[in-house]
């Protein structure tokens, strides 16, 4: 039996949640991925990737951005401008047929509180530096940035194939499979 352990993230309003969801690339590289919030027994899909997944092709739904890296078996999730009401339990989802449930672990428990986050609009202390010289730059030597694709928010959907961040459970060695009911 593998325990589903939550990872708790605490943020102030206005900050950005930034997490990764690992998946078995040989199984799920070409699958659609989604980000869902657990609202009672009904998981609510907030955003999902397109099919087939493409590297460096972000999908944006409101404040949520998903970037799938099928070459690396990684889904990057960002939720910007966090609000208190965003608090809750989140999971990454492999968006497949409901009966093909593969359970991974490490759901995200997000706690957003009011207060100064040092985000835009906050006042900063004046600096007391004596000297400062011109700026230098370092570059990330990665793929060129592509503007995120904006997607219209679809109605909430439900799914059962849960793939949450962390390492994949090898189903041949798992005795307890968690099955999430489907609601139509």
């Amino acid at each position: 039996t593998t325990e589903l352990t939550e990872e708790k993230y605490e943020y102030k309003e206005g900050q950005t949640l930034e997490v990764k969801c690992d998946y078995a690339l040989e199984k799920y590289a070409n699958s659609r991925k989604a980000w869902q919030k657990m609202e009672g027994k009904m998981p609510k899909i907030l955003a999902k990737t397109e099919r087939p997944s493409e590297n460096s092709h972000p999908v944006q739904v409101g404040r949520i951005t998903l970037e799938d890296y099928p070459d690396h078996g990684l889904l990057q999730v960002r939720m910007t401008n966090l609000q208190v009401e965003d608090s809750g339990l989140y999971q990454c989802v492999i968006y497949q047929h409901p009966k093909e449930s593969h359970v991974l672990f490490n759901p995200i428990c997000l706690v957003v509180t009011k207060g100064s986050s040092g985000t835009p609009g906050s006042s900063e202390n004046s600096t007391q530096n004596v000297y400062r010289t011109p700026s230098t730059t370092a570059k990330a030597l990665g793929p060129r940035y592509t503007s995120p694709r904006t997607v219209t928010q679809a109605p909430p959907e439900s799914t059962v194939v849960v793939s949450t961040p962390g390492s994949e459970i090898n189903l041949t060695n798992v005795t307890d499979i968690i099955r999430v009911p489907v609601f139509n």
Epitope: E7, Y11, K12, Q15, T16, E18, V19, K20, C21, D22, A24, L25, S56, E67, Y69, H72, G73, L74, Q76, R78, T80, N106, I108, S117, G118, T119, P120, A138, K139, A140, L141, G142, P143, Y145, P165, G166, S167, E168
Partner: antibody
């Protein structure tokens, strides 16, 4: 407690390869990415890539693609970084580092002690 | 490619406040962390998630953000704080800023 212990200093000739090891202890090795970062003399920190110990998959910075290889041996909780076709520009201290959490790529909360690689003819 | 820009050097008198900036495109939507690096030592994480301090890091270290600029502030700077400081973010790949050498005068 979490520890990352790296192999000792190396002196290599130009054109040769070097393989640096990073032995992890104090946590479940498979659960966290291992990153490799280097610092050349007088230069800043440079991220080389990450290794997912669970799958063995790696993601390399574009600069290093084709001449760096990151692998692991889960039986001894050790990650490896091999750099080929060395030049004098590769003289640097090489660090391994571990993610703070299973569900993030940054920050790097734990670091190895560093391995000095000197490339000289 | 993604870039993070830092001033190469900042100087401050003991007991004063030092501020080191790090700017980059869309940095306001990225989680920023900061590392301290002293000669002959491994980097130390001093700030993560924009403004959180790992255990063991003194309270005089704080982080904040204004727009697409992250700021590491060291209040009541001490001689032992003299070091190189690097910001870091994740945008497809991991990127470090160019580093800022903090000099404590006197």
């Amino acid at each position: 407690q979490v520890q990352l212990v790296q192999s000792g200093a190396e002196v290599k000739k130009p054109g040769a390869s070097v393989k640096v090891s990073c032995k992890a202890s104090g946590y479940t090795f498979n659960g966290y990415y291992i990153h490799w970062v280097r610092q050349a003399p007088g230069q800043g920190l440079e991220w080389m890539g990450w290794l997912n110990p669970n799958s063995g998959g790696a993601n390399y910075a574009q600069k290093f693609q084709g001449w760096v290889t990151m692998t692991r041996d889960t039986s001894i909780s050790t990650a490896y970084m091999e750099l080929s076709r060395l030049t004098s520009d590769d003289t640097a201290v090489y660090y391994c580092a571990r993610d703070q959490r299973k569900t993030t790529v940054t920050p790097f909360e734990y670091w190895g002690q560093g391995t000095l690689v000197t490339v000289s003819s | 490619s993604y870039e993070l820009t830092q001033p190469p050097s900042v100087s401050v008198s003991p007991g004063q406040t030092a501020s080191i900036t790090c700017s980059g495109d869309k940095l306001g939507e990225r989680n920023v962390c900061w590392y301290q690096l002293k000669p002959g030592q491994s980097p130390i994480l001093v700030i993560y998630q924009d403004n959180k301090r790992p255990s063991g890091i003194p309270e005089r270290f704080s982080g904040s953000k204004s727009g697409n600029t992250a700021i590491l502030t060291i209040s009541g700077t001490q001689a032992m704080d003299e070091a190189d400081y690097y910001c870091q973010a994740w945008d497809r790949n991991v990127v470090f800023g160019g580093g800022t050498k903090l000099t404590v005068l006197g």
